[in-house]
Amino acid sequence: AKLGAVYTEGGFVEGVNKKLGLLGDSVDIFKGIPFAAPTKALENPQPHPGWQGTLKAKNFKKRCLQATITQDSTYGDEDCLYLNIWVPQGRKQVSRDLPVMIWIYGGAFLMGSGHGANFLNNYLYDGEEIATRGNVIVVTFNYRVGPLGFLSTGDANLPGNYGLRDQHMAIAWVKRNIAAFGGDPNNITLFGESAGGASVSLQTLSPYNKGLIRRAISQSGVALSPWVIQKNPLFWAKKVAEKVGCPVGDAARMAQCLKVTDPRALTLAYKVPLAGLEYPMLHYVGFVPVIDGDFIPADPINLYANAADIDYIAGTNNMDGHIFASIDMPAINKGNKKVTEEDFYKLVSEFTITKGLRGAKTTFDVYTESWAQDPSQENKKKTVVDFETDVLFLVPTEIALAQHRANAKSAKTYAYLFSHPSRMPVYPKWVGADHADDIQYVFGKPFATPTGYRPQDRTVSKAMIAYWTNFAKTGDPNMGDSAVPTHWEPYTTENSGYLEITKKMGSSSMKRSLRTNFLRYWTLTYLALPTVTDQEATPVPPTGDSEATPVPPTGDSETAPVPPTGDSGAPPVPPTGDSGAPPVPPTGDSGAPPVPPTGDSGAPPVPPTGDSGAPPVPPTGDSGAPPVPPTGDSGAPPVPPTGDAGPPPVPPTGDSGAPPVPPTGDSGAPPVTPTGDSETAPVPPTGDSGAPPVPPTGDSEAAPVPPTDDSKEAQMPAVIRF
């Protein structure tokens, strides 16, 4: 069967019907359907006016305008808001009421596209394998990235989050039109990786998506990741404005000037330094989502009531931090180079600026505890990777899972750890699953380009597609049309259960309490350390006129939820203020070159997981780790849960102005609507209340935006805002 021309709100579209094998199955593929009008720089996306006749949707459109990997030119286009659809078809009737999976690509909110890298004439984000193996509709799309997607003045002049609004427009378009392609508009699953995983998370938390999303999967990135929220957007806006010759004294004049500046100039005005970094890469990515008081009405930690009815899978790769650690400390991948205690201490201190000397020493001691018994270079290098994995990915993901679970009503929560080792032959043997290594398996590359892979890779890919698509169908990764290797139990605050995804899976793949000691350290011990003053915490910013962008100031509130710590029955305590931090790491779409498989298979190279031609650019923002409840001005640590205590502890309130509210389970009060004033972030009910989602506070044309304190511009960012 085949669809032929499909009528959408824009008009008729015609794709291509691709036959699969001899049994009569096929897939209808539509590439390049506009879901919004051509963009205007630094403005919200607008509906597409439509077309007459039948649109031939047979080729991918250009990606959104972005810098090349060398950052000396641009590619892509301003006219970029297009989506792609894969619809599996059987022999007889056209498909009806299929589950829909919408992919959001990663790339540090800086790069990427809906189709991804092209390798062996096969695009990374080609939805065909998922669609045909899982019998689901797959949708991918482009959204604006970099300054054009995320530049913000922190107020109504340039509220920011244009890229997030593009994503929302695509989701809403799918909701309105997918029935015509055979999809079920009431069964939409978002999935994404890295910045895409964080975007998935943010979309579930935004009140704009109420009723649009049924399920969600975040791979290696959540809204609470320290690189996701920019707390000082004005700092970065001014940097770009200075570069392109716009006035910086008055935000309104600066905004007007930026809007009429050549978009290519805006894009190239921002460069992420890739070598010789004085601080961890995380410090340098400036253009990421902001709390705008409207699309993201409050700190994400306070918005989990909005996701109470959305089934959720979140997980990380066991060495997600490897690519970033190897950029921050190149010795990691070099057998002839050593990692010293001094090297690691320096790295740790750069991630723990706000806690000063005590933060650096305590963190260093916790992570180097094993070095006495095993001083080998392999162990030391693994420690560095574990440290960045924990801070950038694992701990924030654990907190997000705990928050989702604590707020969920009927919704289910599942956690995973992807551990199938990287195929990069240039990496040391001890390297596990690096950042973005999971993408190729989710998208079925071992089947699409089989010569680049081994049977065990196909086993992993088959399992992931089965779990992911079963989940999209039913909300339970075990139930659906696809057989799975073992039962995946839901995550609960009591068991902290997670599925370890490897080439051999059985009942022992279901594990509990991942890295509990380190999770406890970040959310309890580290949190309790006093925050040092600006002066004590401020390393000297980069000087000279190098391309290295100076590090922006940090926000002034340290907050975040306490996840369950393994043996406590107490639900996590949501924090109350800025969870906050910087941007996102590349994500699979950023572009490592193709790599030949290792071993003696003689097989051709493994498709790259990126799409630009160099190792992915890690995140860089101003925070480097998962958020944690504020410690207050008193320095008194929050009382940790004791295991069998009744209500969870309430940490001190810090300087955010609003005390955190622990989940109560039976609150009927509606969430507080944010006012746009960052001093009082709204705290939604976190239990199983029937409370409505937190609504936006204004119209999207002039969203209230929390003010940014521009007075601390010389200050370095706090990397870990726990």
């Epitope: 709100e9 824009g10 006016p49 007459q52 809403a172 309105r176 039109n177």
Partner: antibody
């Protein structure tokens, strides 16, 4: 100027079929989609479906799927809407309506054709 | 399908009055169109793309809204404005509101 002229009123028995025509003039016939909308006596407007006169592509509302067929004749700049297995509830005024621009609203309407289904 | 709820279903007003008709869509939509229909006549396009006035339509008619809530406003009713008004959305399966009959008080 744009004109859409529809065929005259019809009286049909239940189970029969009816074919209503809509002749277009004053613009390039193949350049704009043509929709069919009906209105039962004293009721609101109901979308039936759409045809692209350029290539003949059609899309029908779920409710009418299997019962409605839209065709066009480019030589006479005419579109047709045939509704089969008629029942009394199909008694209505049937309108053809042309897109105004892009995919947007229905900017030009025919005068309507009353179809009465009665035994 | 997208559900459209138009209110009120009928309305009595006098010449010179300001009148507002609302239409709520679920889920949210891109654009709303508004039509006027007089007895025995075909509908006539008034407002398209939410707020754009069709040529030849008097400026006392205006449209606004976004997402789920849309409004048609007649700033000062004239005798010829007494008619039935319909909202209309374009998705892959277009739908109309139930109509608002505007009568002379």
């Amino acid at each position: 100027q744009v004109q859409l002229v529809q065929s005259g009123a019809e009286v049909k028995k239940p189970g029969a079929s009816v074919k209503v025509s809509c002749k277009a003039s004053g613009y390039t016939f193949t350049s704009y989609n043509m929709h069919w909308v009906r209105q039962a006596p004293g009721q609101g407007l109901e979308w039936i479906g759409v045809i692209n006169p350029g290539d003949g592509a059609t899309s029908y509302a779920q409710k009418f799927q299997g019962r409605v067929t839209m065709t066009r004749d480019t030589s006479t700049s005419t579109v047709y809407m045939e509704l089969s297995s008629l029942r009394s509830e199909d008694t209505a005024v049937y309108y053809c309506a042309r897109d105004y621009y892009g995919s947007s609203p229905l900017g030009y309407w025919g005068q309507g054709t009353l179809v009465t289904v009665s035994s | 399908d997208i559900q459209m709820t138009q209110s009120p279903s009928s309305l009595s007003a006098s010449v010179g009055d300001r009148v507002t008709i609302t239409c709520r869509a679920s889920p949210s939509i891109s654009y709303m169109n508004w039509y006027q229909q007089k007895p025995g006549k075909a509908p006539k396009l008034l407002i398209y793309a939410t707020s754009r006035l069709q040529s030849g339509v008097p400026s006392r008619f205006s449209g606004s809204g976004s997402g789920t809530d849309f409004t048609l406003t007649i700033s000062s009713l004239q005798p010829e404005d007494f008619a039935t008004y319909y909202c209309h959305q374009r998705s892959s399966s277009p739908t109309f509101g139930q109509g608002t009959k505007l009568e002379i008080k």
